[in-house]
């Protein structure tokens, strides 16, 4: 098994993967296979109303760059506390013995996996023991720039009438064959998106591939600047009883997903008022409605909040609310 895989993101579209060779390989390592697949965001994020008081916005951090070549920074869960920076204590004799035993066990276990669990992969020639798994299309390193990632479909609202279950068939997973090195730059990824990366060490090339059990690591690409900005105008419609319907377009490719919108509005001469618009609210109304507004000139600004944080405020939109008691009752509704 490849050891200590570390994944970091250095841009909104790339993840750098580094690892160490197996400590006791079965024969010579000829190459490594790296598979990756996009992870669907937790369905809870689609369901929860992050405008509710006391409900903290989900913290989603991307995988930060390496501190040093040798540092083993495991990708920390956003829900875990980071440990203080400490030096490791000197190992005791019993620890050293234990590690030697574990190393010996790992070697024996890998041999067992190779000989008993993993049947050598044969090319589908119609005879012999065929690989039960689907054959994976190879991409050469030259194709790294235009990776096409199989994107799992996530229902925008899991508690609606139909929920789609994210599936990512193995045959659609992009992968890379890495020869003579213990690192890979995976490119062409979606911004601020979690990826599950699978790494295997192989000691025989085609036609029969003998590969280790997989080591797994997760990483999230960095956010894309301006991806959470609301593009296009904020439009409005004024209805009877001084109800104003504000409408805007959802950012097309947000960082992760938009969890809420902040609407900030004020009447000329008054203090600013705020409205929080949840995903569900926006989906139902294509925006939001302001009701019970006093007559006067108003300005309104809107910004989206995604898993990566806040987008920019829109340019102010202005509207005028008349005293509806003086307006004929056939006003557009």
């Amino acid at each position: 098994v490849p050891l200590d895989p570390i994944s970091v993101s250095n841009s909104s579209s790339q993840i750098i993967l580094k690892w160490k060779p197996p400590s006791d390989p079965n024969g010579n390592i000829t190459h490594y296979l790296v598979f990756w697949e996009r992870q669907a965001e937790d369905s809870e994020l689609f369901e929860l109303d992050y405008c509710l008081k006391g409900l903290k916005l989900p913290s989603r951090t991307w995988s930060p760059p390496f501190e040093s070549e040798d540092s083993q920074k495991h990708n920390q869960s956003e829900y875990e506390d980071s440990a203080g920076e400490c030096c490791s204590c000197p190992k005791t004799d019993s620890q050293i013995l234990k590690e030697l035993e574990e190393s010996s066990f790992r070697k024996t276990f890998e041999d067992y996996l190779h000989n008993v669990v993993f049947v050598p992969r044969k090319t589908s020639s119609g005879t012999g023991a065929e690989d039960p798994r689907p054959s994976r299309k190879r991409r050469s390193l030259g194709d790294v720039g235009n990776v096409t990632v199989a994107v799992p479909t996530v229902a925008a609202f899991p508690n609606t009438s139909s929920t789609s279950v994210p599936t990512s068939p193995e045959e659609h997973r992009p992968f890379e064959k890495v020869v003579n090195k213990e690192s890979l730059v995976i490119s062409g990824l979606r911004h601020f998106t979690g990826y599950r990366i699978e790494l295997q060490a192989c000691n025989q090339d085609t036609p029969e591939e003998r590969c280790s059990v997989a080591a797994y690591v997760s990483a999230r690409t960095m956010p894309e600047a301006k991806a959470d900005d609301i593009v296009g105008p904020v439009t409005h419609e004024i209805f009877e009883n001084n109800v104003v319907h504000l409408m805007w377009q959802e950012p097309k490719e947000p960082n992760g997903l938009i969890v809420l919108y902040e609407v900030s509005y004020r009447r000329y001469g008054d203090e600013e008022l705020h409205l929080c618009v949840s995903r569900k609210h926006f989906a139902l109304e294509r925006g939001c409605r302001l009701r019970g507004l006093s007559p006067g000139n108003y300005s309104v600004r809107i910004r989206a909040t995604s898993l990566a944080g806040n987008g920019s405020w829109t340019e102010p939109t202005y509207f005028y609310v008349t005293d509806y008691l003086d307006v004929p009752s056939n006003i557009a509704k």
Epitope: S161, F239, L284, E285, R291, K333
Partner: antibody, heavy 118, light 112 residues
Framework: EVQLVETGGGVVQPGRSLRLSCAAS????????MHWVRQAPGKGLEWVAV????????YYADSVKGRFTISRDNSKNTLYLQMNSLRAEDTAVYYC????WGFGFDYWGQGTTVTVSS | DVVMTQSPLSLPVTLGQPASISCRSS???????????LNWFQQRPGQSPRRLIY???KRDSGVPDRFSGSGSGTDFTLKISRVEAEDVGVYYC?????????FGGGTKLEIK
């Protein structure tokens, strides 16, 4: 003037189906999310389902999930409720209502009565 | 779901006298933006419901000023300063802060 008129109610046996309609007029129907709310005889109000302005998002009360389907035809300014596998406890007056987030419902129809009985 | 509890169940009132209906929610109805989405509906006999009050205290257009709403957090009140014959019916509180929106059980206002 905003008007909502429900039709399609009636007496039906348990396990059978019924489709309710709600004709809307006097406002831009396609700009509003719409709800169905019901009221069992002598009882209080119970929210049933909502559909977004475009029809792409739908939500249901747990009591009807999997049995009832809300839909709309914006070209006809009409809201629908398809009720399958009806039970005695679905007996109620069914109202369609216009949605206002947080503020509940600003306009209601007159209601249509559904009786589920063998 | 958020439970809305109304009291009393029945409220006999003399014409011209004040009336007060209480509504209590199982959770605070203050939304993250500071708004409180508590609404009051009136249902006259044989009619469909009609909204009287939204956001705790704001009267809908056409609602007489004898109706007023107050409260905060989890405790809310609808007051009628002088009851008139046309006020007879059932009054419901409804919260719109949490999904799904839920109604109180109703308070039946009748004339003594």
């Amino acid at each position: 003037e905003v008007q909502l008129v429900e039709t399609g109610g009636g007496v039906v046996q348990p396990g059978r189906s019924l489709r309710l309609s709600c004709a809307a007029s006097g406002f831009t129907f396609s700009s509003y999310a719409m709800h169905w709310v019901r009221q069992a005889p002598g009882k209080g109000l119970e929210w049933v389902a909502v559909i977004s302005y475009s029809g792409s998002n739908k939500y249901y009360a747990d009591s009807v999930k999997g049995r009832f389907t809300i839909s709309r035809d914006n070209s006809k300014n009409t809201l629908y409720l398809q009720m399958n596998s009806l039970r005695a406890e679905d007996t109620a007056v069914y109202y369609c209502a216009r949605h206002e987030w947080g503020f509940g419902f600003d306009y209601w129809g007159q209601g249509t009565t559904v009786t589920v009985s063998s | 779901d958020v439970v809305m509890t109304q009291s009393p169940l029945s409220l006999p009132v003399t014409l011209g006298q004040p009336a007060s209906i209480s509504c209590r929610s199982s959770q605070s109805l203050v939304y993250g933006d500071g708004n409180t989405y508590l609404n009051w509906f009136q249902q006259r006999p044989g009619q469909s419901p009609r909204r009287l009050i939204y956001k705790v205290s704001k009267r809908d257009s056409g609602v007489p000023d004898r109706f007023s709403g107050s409260g905060s957090g989890t405790d809310f009140t609808l007051k009628i300063s002088r009851v008139e014959a046309e006020d007879v019916g059932v009054y419901y509180c409804m919260q719109g802060t949490y999904w799904p929106m839920t109604f109180g059980g109703g308070t039946k206002l009748e004339i003594k």
